[in-house]
C-alpha cells in the first residue's frame, strides 16, 4: 500500500525548492526499480516528484490566500514490468499559513448617524476587519479592535468592533466626529499586523433647544392708512436646533386692543406682525403687544427643554397720515321751492379735517351755474329755479383743506325743486272742430282734455267753462265730464256756411291749485256744407268724427 504522512507546505517560501514530504509504496525496497509519477493541476509546475524516491518538492512560492490546498494523484510503476505497483491514488497538499496579511476594513468608508445626547452605551456602528490569513491557524487572523482617536466620546468593543457612546454629546457644540479604529491580528501580541479605518460619526439633532427671541423689544411703525391684513414688520427668534426641530410658531400673548395678529412664515421661521383692525392716529397713536414663540414639534420626553416659552415686547407707533376732509354725512338732500329769488338759501354742508391740526375747509361746487357755496358750506341759488325745467339737481360738493389743497373730499348733494302752482291748465293738444249746416241741437262737436305742467300734490282736477261772451252767444255749450275732460255740443239747430263759416269759442280751464289758475283756450269750429246723410266732399274727415256724435236731451 501507499505510505505517506499529511503534506504541508508553508506559504511564501522563497527557496527555489522546498521539500514537502515523501510518498512511497511499502513494496519499495529501495533498489530504484520503482518510478513515482505526480498527476493533476500543479503537477510539474508547482510541485515535482523525485521519480526514484517519491520525494515531493514545491518549486514555486505559494500563497495560501490564493489557494490553500492542492489535490494531486500519485502513480508508482515497476520499471522492469511497466506495471502499476499500487492503484492510482489521490493525496492532498495543504498550504500552511503564515501571518503575512494585515487586517483590512473592506467595507470602507464607514459613516454613522446617532442622535445627540444619546446615553452612554448607545450602539453607533460595528466595523469589521478581514484578515486574509487562516482563522484556524493560530492567532494569525484573530483580531483585536482599539480606538486610536475618538476618546472620550466613543469606545470600541475589542473583539466585536462595535463602537459605542461613552459620553453624551451636544450637536450644537460639535456635530460630527472622526473616530479612528485599529484592528490588530495575533490578538495584539508582538509581531501583530494592524490596519486602521476612519469612521465619520454624525450627530443627528434632537429638539433640546427652545426658540429664543434675541431682542427683548421690537419697535415697529404702521401708517394709519394701512388696510387690514397689512404686514407691518417681522420678529425673529433663534433655535439652535435644525430642521423640523427648529420650526417655530409665533403667537400673541397680550394685545388688549385686539388690533394685531402674528402669523408664522414657515420658510424663514419669522413672525410677521399683521394689522387685524385699522388704526387711527387721532384715536390712538401707539400700541404695546407681547409675542411668544414655541417649537412646532415637541416630543413628550423633551418637554423639559420647553417649559417656558420665550417672549418679546413689540412697540408699535402709528404714523399720522394727512387725511382728507371728512363730511358729517355721506350725502345731503335739500329742498327749495321753485321761483324763489336768486340768492335763496338751499342748505348747509359741513366737513372737518380729521387730523390734529384741524385745517380750515374750503368748499366748491363742481360745474354748476345754478348754485353757489360759501366757506361755511352754505349753498344758495344763483338763479330762480323752475321745477318744470328741472325738478332735481345732482351736485358734487368738494371740501379742500386750506393748508393742503391736495387733501380733497367730495360728496353728492341732491337738491329737490318743490312745486308751486305757477302754471294754468291748457288744452292737451290743438283742437280744430267741424259742424254741419244741418246739424241738430245737442250734437257733440268735440271732446277736449287739459294738461297742467305743475306737479300735482294730490291729483289734478280741471274745471271747464265757456267764456261769458260765448255763454251769451249760445250757439254751443260745454259739459264738464268731471274726469278732466269736457264735451262741446251744438246749442241750436242749423248753421249757415255763408253767414258764419267759423266760430271761435273761448274755453276757460281752471285748476284746483291754491290759488287756482285759469287759462283761456280758443276752440275753432268750421261750418261745413253737408248732405242729408251728414257727409260732404269737403268734410270727409269731419264726417267720420261727426258720425260718432250723439245727441243729448
Amino acid at each position: 500500500g501507499w505510505v505517506w504522512n499529511q503534506f504541508f507546505v508553508p506559504e511564501e517560501m522563497n527557496t527555489t525548492s522546498h521539500h514537502v514530504g515523501r510518498l512511497r509504496s511499502d513494496l519499495d525496497n529501495g533498489n530504484n526499480s520503482f518510478q513515482y509519477k505526480l498527476l493533476g493541476a500543479g503537477a510539474g509546475s508547482t510541485f515535482i516528484i523525485d521519480e526514484r524516491t517519491g520525494d515531493i518538492y514545491a518549486i514555486e512560492k505559494l500563497d495560501r490566500e490564493e489557494r490553500s490546498l492542492y489535490i494531486l494523484r500519485a502513480q508508482v510503476i515497476d520499471i522492469t514490468t511497466g506495471r502499476a505497483v499500487e492503484p492510482e491514488s489521490e493525496f492532498v497538499i495543504k498550504v500552511s499559513d503564515i501571518n503575512d496579511n494585515e487586517p483590512k476594513f473592506l467595507d470602507e468608508p464607514y459613516e454613522a448617524i446617532v442622535p445627540e445626547m444619546s446615553p452612554e452605551g448607545t450602539l453607533v456602528i460595528q466595523v469589521t476587519a478581514s484578515d486574509a490569513d487562516d482563522p484556524s491557524s493560530g492567532n494569525n487572523a484573530r483580531l483585536l479592535y482599539s480606538l486610536l482617536q475618538g476618546q472620550p466620546y466613543f469606545s470600541v468593543e475589542p473583539t466585536t468592533g462595535v463602537i459605542r457612546i461613552s459620553s453624551k454629546m451636544d450637536r450644537e457644540l460639535q456635530d460630527e466626529y472622526w473616530v479612528i479604529i485599529q484592528a490588530k491580528d495575533m490578538i495584539g501580541q508582538p509581531g501583530a499586523l494592524s490596519g486602521t479605518t476612519s469612521v465619520l460619526i454624525k450627530l443627528s439633532d434632537v429638539n433640546d433647544n427652545k426658540p429664543i427671541f434675541k431682542e427683548s423689544l421690537y419697535r415697529l411703525t404702521v401708517s394709519e392708512s394701512a388696510p387690514t391684513g397689512t404686514s407691518i414688520g417681522t420678529i425673529m427668534a433663534y433655535d439652535n436646533d435644525i430642521g423640523e426641530n427648529a420650526e417655530m410658531d409665533y403667537s400673541i400673548e397680550e394685545d388688549d386692543s385686539q388690533t394685531f395678529d402674528i402669523i408664522t412664515n414657515h420658510e424663514t421661521q419669522e413672525g410677521i406682525v399683521i394689522l387685524k383692525k385699522k388704526v387711527n392716529f387721532e384715536h390712538q397713536n401707539h400700541y404695546g403687544i407681547r409675542a411668544k414663540v414655541k417649537n412646532h414639534h415637541v416630543d413628550e420626553q423633551l418637554m423639559k427643554y420647553h417649559t417656558e416659552a420665550s417672549t418679546t415686547f413689540i412697540k408699535i407707533q402709528v404714523e399720522d397720515v394727512d387725511e382728507p376732509p371728512l363730511f358729517l354725512l355721506p350725502y345731503y338732500i335739500f329742498e327749495i321751492f321753485e321761483e324763489t329769488p336768486q340768492g335763496s338759501f338751499v342748505g348747509v354742508v359741513s366737513a372737518t379735517d380729521p387730523d390734529n391740526r384741524k385745517s380750515p375747509i374750503r368748499y366748491s361746487i363742481t360745474r354748476s351755474k345754478v348754485f353757489n357755496i360759501d366757506d361755511n358750506g352754505t349753498i344758495t341759488t344763483t338763479n330762480s329755479l323752475d321745477r318744470e325745467i328741472s325738478a332735481w339737481y345732482n351736485l358734487s360738493i368738494t371740501a379742500t383743506e386750506k393748508y393742503n389743497i391736495e387733501q380733497i373730499s367730495s360728496i353728492p348733494v341732491y337738491v329737490q325743486v318743490l312745486n308751486i302752482n305757477d302754471h294754468a291748465p291748457e288744452f292737451s293738444q290743438y283742437y280744430e272742430s267741424y259742424v254741419c249746416e244741418n246739424a241738430g241741437s245737442g250734437q257733440v262737436i268735440q271732446t277736449i282734455s287739459a294738461v297742467d305742467r305743475d306737479e300735482s300734490i294730490e291729483e289734478h282736477h280741471f274745471y271747464f267753462n265757456l267764456s261769458v261772451e260765448d255763454t251769451n252767444s249760445s250757439s254751443f255749450t260745454i259739459i264738464d265730464n268731471q274726469d278732466n275732460t269736457a264735451v262741446i255740443l251744438t246749442n241750436r239747430t242749423g248753421f249757415n256756411l255763408q253767414e258764419e263759416p267759423i266760430f271761435y269759442i273761448s274755453i276757460l280751464i281752471a285748476d284746483n291749485g291754491i290759488p287756482s289758475l285759469t287759462s283761456t283756450n280758443t276752440l275753432t269750429i268750421h261750418v261745413c256744407d253737408c248732405d242729408d246723410s251728414g257727409s260732404t266732399q269737403t268734410c270727409q274727415y269731419q264726417e267720420l268724427m261727426l258720425s260718432m256724435g250723439f245727441k243729448t236731451e
Epitope: 498527476l39 493533476g40 493541476a41 509546475s45 500563497d63 495560501r64 490566500e65 490564493e66 489557494r67 490553500s68 490546498l69 489535490i71 494523484r73 492510482e88 489521490e90 496579511n101 483590512k104 473592506l106 478581514s130 486574509a132
Partner: antibody, heavy 120, light 108 residues
C-alpha cells in the same frame, strides 16, 4: 450576495483588441480563496475557459489563447478586465465573467454575459 | 488537457421521468474537482453540483451527482418542466480547466 456584470463594446473590428470589464458588487474582489475568470461561448456551442486572475495580480490562461490574452484587476474599482488582441470572426461569442473557487475550481456566480461580434 | 465527453448529446424525456446524464474524462479527475452546470437559452450557466456530488445553494434535491476517476453522472430523479435545458460538466483537476460539450435535455 456577490453579483457580476460584464460591460464593453458589442462590436469589434477584425485585428483589433476586444476589451471587456467585469464589475463585482455585493462583495470585495480582494477576498482570498477566489479567482476571477473569463469564459466564452461561441454561438450554439459549448463553454471555453479563457483564464482567471487572483486579486493580487497572478494570472492563469488557457494555453490555446495565452498569446493573445491579458487579464488585469483593479481592486479600487472592484473590477477585472479582459483584453483579447488580434481578433477574428472566430472570436465572436458570448463572453461571461465568473468567480472561481480557487481550491475546488467551480464557477459561481456568473455574469449574465455579453455578446461580442467581430465584424468589419 | 483533459477532454470531457458528455453523452448522450440529446436526451428526450417527459416531465416526471428520471434523467441520467454522463460525463467521461480522458484521464482520471479527482471527484473534488468535477462540477455540473445548467444553462437555459439566453442565460448564463448556473452551478448545480460541485465536488462531483455536493449540491450548490438553492438547488432542489432532485438533482444529484456521483462518480469518480473518469466516469461521472448527473441524475435528475423526477423531471420538472423547468429542468429542460443544456447541462455541462467541468473539471479543475488539470490545466487547462475544461468543460464538456453539453447534453441537451429536451421535452419528449
Amino acid at each position: 450576495q456577490v453579483q457580476l456584470q460584464e460591460s464593453g463594446p458589442g462590436l469589434v473590428k477584425p485585428s483589433q483588441t476586444l476589451s471587456l470589464t467585469c464589475t463585482v458588487s455585493g462583495g470585495s474582489i480582494s477576498r482570498g480563496g477566489y479567482y476571477w475568470s473569463w469564459i466564452r461561448q461561441h454561438p450554439g456551442k459549448g463553454l471555453e475557459w479563457i483564464g482567471y486572475i487572483f486579486y493580487r495580480g497572478r494570472t492563469y490562461y488557457n494555453p490555446s489563447l495565452k498569446s493573445r490574452v491579458t487579464i488585469s484587476v483593479d481592486t479600487s474599482k472592484n473590477q477585472f478586465s479582459l483584453k483579447l488582441s488580434s481578433v477574428t470572426a472566430a472570436d465572436t461569442a458570448v463572453y461571461y465573467c465568473a468567480r472561481v473557487n480557487s481550491n475546488y475550481g467551480w464557477f459561481d456566480p456568473w455574469g449574465q454575459g455579453t455578446l461580442v461580434t467581430v465584424s468589419s | 488537457e483533459i477532454v470531457l465527453t458528455q453523452f448522450p448529446g440529446t436526451l428526450s424525456l417527459s416531465p416526471g421521468e428520471r434523467a441520467t446524464l454522463s460525463c467521461r474524462a480522458s484521464q482520471s479527475v479527482s471527484s473534488s474537482y468535477l462540477a455540473w452546470y445548467q444553462q437555459k437559452p439566453g442565460q448564463a450557466p448556473r452551478l448545480l453540483i460541485y465536488g462531483a456530488s455536493s449540491r450548490a445553494t438553492g438547488i432542489p434535491d432532485r438533482f444529484s451527482g456521483s462518480g469518480s476517476g473518469t466516469d461521472f453522472t448527473l441524475t435528475i430523479s423526477r423531471l420538472e418542466p423547468e429542468d429542460f435545458a443544456v447541462y455541462y460538466c467541468q473539471q479543475y483537476g488539470s490545466s487547462p480547466l475544461t468543460f464538456g460539450g453539453g447534453t441537451k435535455l429536451e421535452i419528449k
